[in-house]
């Protein structure tokens, strides 16, 4: 079998949901000593980078300026050390937001409920779209989808304090082009878990894995580079649409 290097890790810096006309940054984390990185978009070569000097950094950041629906879609990357190419990274779905209109998000029976109550979110958008998306702040990889002509329902079933948090919804014009986000709706769940005050709440900061962890080489990093890369590939889970 043809020998290949371990696959790189592709990430979106800050977020994979990029407002139109803003810049997206994608990092491809490969290996110290990589002489070339390639970013592929929808299966075709999109950008090429040759780090200088190659042995000093374990990846590159690709910028995608002026985000629009043409640049939204599936990205992957590969790298080369000498003449040897890596396997292809997982696919990363890059979404353009702030397209066209703003949906309205509401929750029934209301934003303050008791643990065990059934809760349904409603996302409404009057313009031509049939797919709606509900995201919880700090959990933007866990996208819930629902379909409807101008409104979609998101039944949550009986809720627990783990459902607490801030929610937004989007209308989707295709998998990679989303509307402006709705105003957030904060769901407060109180109730009969032993001690509600100690119940965990979700972080409201951006997803912790949406960061580019590129490092410059030191002696220790050189020794750990391959082990670290293999470990990260093993543990890195990436959301697919």
């Amino acid at each position: 079998p043809k020998q290949t290097l371990p696959k790189p890790i592709i990430r979106a810096e800050s977020t994979y949901m990029v407002p139109k006309e803003k810049q997206a940054t994608l990092c491809c984390q490969g290996s110290y000593g990589a002489v070339e990185y390639q970013l592929h978009f929808e299966g075709s070569l999109f950008a090429v980078e040759r780090p200088k000097p190659p042995e000093r950094i374990n990846g590159v950041k690709f910028h995608i300026p002026d985000m629009n629906s043409r640049k939204a879609g599936r990205y992957s990357c590969i790298y080369r050390v000498g003449e040897l190419w890596s396997e292809r990274s997982d696919l990363l779905d890059l979404v353009v937001t702030e397209m066209y209109d703003t949906p309205t998000l509401s929750v029934h029976p209301g934003p303050e409920v008791t643990s065990g109550e059934k809760v349904t979110f409603y996302c409404r958008l009057d313009t031509a779209t049939s797919m709606f998306l509900l995201l919880k702040e700090g959990r933007s990889r866990d996208v819930q989808r629902s379909y409807g002509k101008v409104q979609a329902e998101f039944p949550m079933g009986p809720v627990t304090t783990a459902h607490r948090g801030s929610y937004r919804c989007f209308g989707s014009y295709n998998n990679y082009a989303w509307s402006f986000p709705s105003e957030p709706v904060k769901l407060l769940v109180t109730g009969d878990i032993e001690n509600t005050s100690l119940a965990p709440t979700d972080p409201t900061f951006p997803d912790s894995w949406d960061t580019c962890l590129l490092t410059r080489e030191t002696g220790l990093q050189k020794d750990l580079a391959l082990w670290d890369h293999t470990a990260q590939n093993h543990h890195h889970h990436h959301h697919h649409h």
């Epitope: 075709s44 950008a47 090429v48 980078e49 040759r50 950041k61 690709f62 910028h63 300026p65």
Partner: nanobody, 129 residues
Framework: DVQLVESGGGSVQAGGSLRLSCAAS????????MGWFRQFPGKERERVAL????????FYADFVEGRFTISLDNAKNTLSLQMNSLKPEDTAMYYC??????????????????????WGQGTQVTVSS
């Protein structure tokens, strides 16, 4: 404003050579990509060769097969494409383009033509058998 003016196109026999030039003016950024693209009638422009001012680093399309060489004379702000061993299938309109680098380091280039902001008017290359 950025201006790109190509020259050097013309007609040549198969196996012959041509040197295309592109005079660039007005680019304010220190690092940028310049490239040669070509277009066949009724088709989209395709990349031929790219060069990054930060390297300079060069990138070629597979079909070039070592026949073409891209170079940049920073002092004269001139981009060149030396085309050797020309084939009839190289007949096309050739365009010079400029755009931003694909990263902060300035050592990378975008590949799709829609990532390039500035274009010359094109120069025709005709290779007869």
């Amino acid at each position: 404003d950025v201006q790109l003016v190509e020259s050097g196109g013309g007609s040549v026999q198969a196996g012959g050579s041509l040197r295309l030039s592109c005079a660039a003016s007005g680019y304010r950024s220190r690092h940028y990509c310049m490239g040669w693209f070509r277009q066949f009638p009724g088709k989209e422009r395709e990349r031929v060769a790219l060069i990054n001012t930060g390297g300079p680093t060069t990138f070629y399309a597979d079909f070039v097969e070592g026949r073409f060489t891209i170079s940049l004379d920073n002092a004269k702000n001139t981009l060149s494409l030396q085309m050797n061993s020309l084939k009839p299938e190289d007949t096309a309109m050739y365009y010079c383009a400029a755009g931003p680098p694909s990263s902060d380091s300035g050592s990378g280039c975008y590949v799709p033509e829609y990532m390039y902001n500035y274009w010359g008017q094109g120069t025709q290359v005709t290779v007869s058998s």
